[in-house]
């Protein structure tokens, strides 16, 4: 018991650190006054409880009274939020609070109430965010076996118990322990901002979280914002136990991918109807966003920080803006935001000087798509400024005429008519193809190089869509490029995949068929209506990943590239999928970001729809966080079953 | 739509302070330069203060040390931090900017000091 082995003191007695069989352990030596029954409560719990998210009990002694437990290498967790909060990644916060939560669950289905859960009692065995274990839960001293009706003694620690457990005398169940969670993934999310203050001032630390009148984490401690851990810390929150998740759908909300993937939830005001949106160029001093929205008589640009989240809009044009650009001209350092409206117009505007503004050449029908493209890196070689129009031209500017008011396009391509729009630009990913872009005109898929002239012209209409003929002849509305073309047509649920040399269609990714998957497991849809809300609204490439498809539904669903397997649907993620588009955005560094509608009912006898935009921030990692997370959840189950099987031996 | 909505002003005693805020709407908010004029009675407006885009500030001699103006992106809002009042400092404070066409004009808010 020399004080350099010294771990911890309680009013139980002391921790040390120690050899047992040739490993190092913790052992708990309780005070010579200790009870026989704490030691035997500690036991009992410590006895029939094994799972890789609870300190397991190697060995028991009477004389002195101790228990020999594991040692977990990396201390506690209050300990790393004190002084080593810099390891402290999204990742890691993440496993951290999924693995206590597992515990939580595990602890709760034997129907123990663990009545203390804090920082202080999370034991973390390493920071490796893919180790099977990371974290558990330790110190069952005040652990209880209740009964359904829940039980009465006034525990925990002020400033980590839930409202009901701090007023005593009145009965309390496991719930109890989703409140201290809440607390807990509070202090992970703000690394430990309130446990330094509450030292500072410790009657007023219990007081505030019983209120439920913590800070907002993000505004308060300006850490990063995590939309669906604040949703969850908020519902654990709840003062009404009965309100408040149990842990097991604690666990459930904790194990998915998109809760660690999403990292920014942006409602725009309502009935902005947002068209299209260009980010920012990543070297410029805000991760901001330009949006184009307005109805059919005017059109409204707006502009969102995104570190702010500030929202600003100003009414630019006389007829909706259908597509936006961002040119950038480093030697001039300045850019320009071009607006391509319903009516034809292409307005440029300064993007730091709402003053400097004029509009280009007309064009003969509405500006249906803007690419501004880099067939060079180097900004010595010329960029051009794409323009697609509705009556299936494509018209050609050298991107520093931008500046210049009334600037005619160097060149003007007759691809289509106005039966066939040209509706999409897009250049390829495949990096062996550098200076190829490539279009979607009526049914058509074109590519062309940098002297502008067409290499290829593929015609799409197909008898090879079997019960999706009937989009055969739909217009293309959307073309990535990658090392096959991937398309999508106007109102079919099918994205299209064709092959570049042969010019032969060579797969069909069936969205209403992944769909079905998903939803016949939850009894969601009728066919017809999965139809209709799988029709494919936007497409996005991640490099050598993945192929984002966002749907009219709502629905956002990810493919791997190489194999073209579902890796995840994400379901309802709002009424209709609009825009998404990959970005650099300062220190945000490669998101993906999606812009959805959603349709709400308003009050009253007519029965309006009211539309609000919602933009969403997600970590460009998200296909592979999925894939990681199901291997991580499977080692785990595994360890589990192993643990329970060793126990019942 | 373009919409400055000024506040803040108000009843003062000379050498006292206020400080006027001026919100901005139906613009795009930091591409700007935003102004403070004002107008006392009989007289004809002057120009108080100017923050540029990128927060620069510039004052009328008769304020210069005395008034401060600042702006928030993220509020679209202009403020002017008035100390030191002077009787002759009453007047109706405006908001302004000037954008791609004309200068925008809030309603004024009345400051008046008393001696």
């Known amino acids: 018991q020399a004080p350099e082995f010294l771990l911890g003191d309680g009013s139980f007695g002391s921790v040390y650190r120690a050899a047992y069989e040739g490993e190092e352990v913790a052992v708990k030596i309780f005070n010579k006054h200790t009870s026989l029954r704490l030691l035997r409560q500690e036991l009992v719990v410590l006895c029939h409880l094994h799972h890789p998210s609870l300190i397991s009990l190697l060995a028991a002694g009477i004389r002195p009274r101790m228990l020999v437990m594991e040692l977990a290498s990396k201390g506690s967790l209050d300990r790393l939020l004190q002084q080593d909060k810099a390891s402290l990644t999204r990742t890691l916060q993440h496993r951290i609070a999924l693995h206590v939560a597992d515990g939580l669950r595990y602890l709760h289905s034997a129907m123990i109430i663990y009545r203390d859960l804090k920082p202080h009692n999370v034991l973390l065995f390493t920071l490796y965010p893919n180790a099977a274990i990371i974290a558990k839960i330790a110190d069952y001293g005040i652990a209880q076996y209740c009964c359904r009706m829940g039980i009465k003694t006034s525990e925990g620690t002020p400033g980590f118990r839930a409202p009901e457990v701090a007023r005593g005398n009145v009965i309390y169940n496991q719930q109890a322990d989703v409140y201290s969670f809440g607390l807990l993934l509070y202090d992970i999310l703000t690394t430990g901002g309130r446990i330094v203050e509450g030292l500072k001032f410790p009657n007023e630390f219990d007081e505030l979280e019983i209120q439920g009148k913590l800070p907002d984490p993000v505004k308060e401690y300006g850490c990063a914002p995590w939309p669906m851990v604040e949703k969850l810390i908020k519902q654990c929150l709840k003062e009404n136990p009965q309100e408040r998740p149990t842990s097991a759908q604690v666990f459930d909300i904790l194990n998915s991918a998109e809760l660690v993937c999403l990292t920014r939830r942006i409602l725009l005001p309502k009935n902005v109807i947002v068209e299209c949106m260009v980010a920012t160029h990543h070297n410029s001093r805000n991760a901001s966003i330009w949006l184009g929205c307005g109805h059919t008589d005017r059109g409204q640009l707006s502009f969102l920080d995104l570190n702010t989240e500030g929202y600003t809009s100003e009414e630019v044009a006389d007829s909706r803006i259908l597509c936006l650009a961002l040119v950038h001209l480093p030697v001039e350092k300045e850019s320009w935001i071009v607006s391509g409206t319903q009516s034809g117009t292409l307005l440029v505007i300064n993007t730091e000087d709402g003053k400097k503004r004029h509009t280009l050449e007309k064009m003969t029908d509405s500006v249906t798509c803007l690419y501004c493209n880099s067939f060079s890196k180097q900004s010595k070689q010329k960029n051009f400024l794409l323009v697609g129009t509705a009556d299936g031209k494509l018209a050609i500017f050298e991107d520093k005429t931008v500046k210049l008011k009334g600037a005619a396009p160097l060149k003007i391509l007759n691809i289509g008519n106005v039966s066939t729009p040209l509706m999409c630009l897009s250049e390829s990913t495949n990096s062996t193809e550098r200076n190829v872009m490539w279009g979607g005109c009526g049914t058509k898929i074109f590519s062309f190089s940098n002297d502008f002239t067409i290499q290829k012209l593929i015609e799409t209409r197909t008898s090879q869509l079997f019960s999706y003929a009937a989009f055969s002849d739909s217009n293309i509305i959307t073309v990535v490029v990658d090392t096959a073309l991937y398309i999508a047509k106007q109102n079919s649920p099918v994205v299209e995949v064709w092959d570049k040399k042969t010019e032969k269609l060579c797969g069909l990714i069936d969205c209403v068929h992944f769909l079905r998957e998903v939803m016949v497991k939850e009894n969601k849809e009728s066919k017809h209506k999965m139809s209709y809300s799988g029709r494919v609204k936007t497409l996005c490439l991640q490099k050598n990943t993945a192929l984002w498809i966002g749907t009219g539904g709502g629905h956002i669903l990810l493919l791997d590239l190489s194999t073209r397997r579902l890796i995840r649907v994400i379901y309802n993620f709002c009424n209709s999928v609009r825009v998404m588009m990959t970005a650099q955005l300062g220190s945000l560094k490669n998101v993906m970001l999606v812009l959805g509608y959603n349709r709400k009912n308003t009050e009253g006898t007519q029965k309006q729809k009211e539309i609000q935009s919602c933009l969403t921030v997600w970590d460009i990692n998200l296909p592979h966080e999925v894939q990681n997370l199901e291997k991580h959840i499977e080692v785990r189950k595994e360890l589990a079953e192993k643990m329970r099987r060793t126990s019942v031996e | 739509q373009v919409q400055l909505v000024e506040s803040g002003g108000g009843l003062v005693q000379a050498g006292g302070s206020l400080r006027l805020s001026c919100a901005a709407s139906g613009i795009i908010f930091h591409w700007y330069d935003m102004d403070w004029y004002r107008q006392a009675p009989g007289k004809q407006r002057e120009l108080v203060a100017t923050i540029t885009t990128g927060g620069r500030a510039d004052y009328a001699d008769f304020v210069k040390g005395r008034f401060s103006i600042s702006r928030d992106n993220a509020k679209t809002t202009v403020y002017l931090q008035m100390n030191s009042l002077k009787p002759e400092d009453t007047a109706v404070y405006y908001c302004?900017?000037?954008?791609?066409?004309?200068?925008?004009w809030g309603q004024g808010t009345q400051v008046t000091v008393s001696s």
């Open positions: 302004s900017f000037q954008d791609h066409v004309l200068r925008r």
